[in-house]
């Protein structure tokens, strides 16, 4: 959960410096890439690579840029108007229902099933029953029951998305 951070909490080099680009608020709000000064008179630019704001706002400070976790790759860097975009490394995925970490994709489908969808950064492999064509959403079977589709060991039990 987020913690409340004020200008006073920030290190001196992170605080709004006098030389930062300023403009005037419009209807009490500052444009993307800026935050409002404490007296409400100025819009102060965010610091490239350090913080950002994506919309018109009345924030007293810009939002901190996300740092990609280990196991993630940086798709695009943080700018003054857009946060860092991180993506799971190849062979791992992040489900919407459990987005806290990248999980290892399964290496194959259970016996009697065929793979119809590859591992992507946002989904595990997708398996369907050979006969019925229905999706599998159960747990990963034991290793000897797994039909391997790529090298490596099966991931820990998990549900398939989709």
């Amino acid at each position: 959960e987020s913690a409340l951070i004020t200008q006073q909490d920030l290190a001196p080099q992170q605080r709004a410096a006098p030389q930062q680009k300023r403009s005037s608020p419009s209807e009490g709000l500052c444009p993307p890439g800026h935050h409002i000064s404490e007296d409400g008179r100025d819009c102060i630019s965010c610091k490239y690579g350090q913080d950002y704001s994506t919309h018109w706002n009345d924030l007293l400070f810009c939002l901190r840029c996300t740092r990609c976790d280990s196991g993630e790759v940086e798709l695009s860097p943080c700018t003054t108007t857009r946060n860092t975009v991180c993506q799971c490394e190849e062979g791992t995925f992040r489900e919407e229902d459990s987005p806290e970490m990248c999980r290892k994709c399964r290496t194959g489908c259970p016996r009697g099933m065929v793979k119809v969808g590859d591992c992507t950064p946002w989904s595990d492999i997708e398996c369907v029953h050979k006969e019925s064509g229905t999706k599998h959403s159960g747990e990963v079977p034991a290793v000897e029951e797994t039909v391997t589709s790529s090298p490596g060991t099966p991931a820990s039990p998990c549900s398939l998305s989709g």
């Epitope: 959960e1 987020s2 409340l4 935050h35 706002n57 924030l59 939002l63 229902d97 987005p99 806290e100």
Partner: nanobody, 126 residues
Framework: EVQLLESGGGEVQPGGSLRLSCAAS????????VGWFRQAPGKEREFVSA????????YYAESVKGRFTISKDNAKRTLYLQMSSLRAEDTAVYYC???????????????????WGQGTLVTVKP
């Protein structure tokens, strides 16, 4: 279980005002950012405004800038959206939403939100 209940919608003339409320049943309301979205008939759900968990600072879509004001009462677990100078294009179902994960300071996209109310209809017409 997270429950969000919007109220305050209705029919209003152009230039009029409405105040929407969203009551939350979840105890983490006071530590979470919250957002308002809207969906007009035949269109995709779009971001309107979002407020920080501590209610110090908010985001606004450019289309509502200067006309709408978001606020949050953590003690009452209630989110508000004061809407003024309403226009025909503001006609939509308005939803309040809580994010699906707690590490984003101020989420502003539909996919970042996992808990949604049923919505309240706002109609602006002469």
């Amino acid at each position: 279980e997270v429950q969000l209940l919007e109220s305050g919608g209705g029919e209003v003339q152009p230039g009029g005002s409405l105040r929407l409320s969203c009551a939350a049943s979840v105890s983490t309301f006071g530590t979470s950012p919250v957002g308002w979205f809207r969906q007009a008939p035949g269109k995709e759900r779009e971001f309107v405004s979002a407020i920080r968990w501590d209610a110090v600072g908010a985001y606004y879509a450019e289309s509502v800038k200067g006309r709408f004001t978001i606020s949050k009462d953590n003690a009452k677990r209630t989110l508000y959206l004061q809407m003024s100078s309403l226009r025909a294009e503001d006609t939509a179902v308005y939803y309040c939403a809580l994010p699906r994960r707690g590490d984003s300071e101020l989420p502003s996209t539909v996919k970042e939100y996992g808990y949604w109310g049923q919505g309240t209809l706002v109609t602006v017409k002469p």
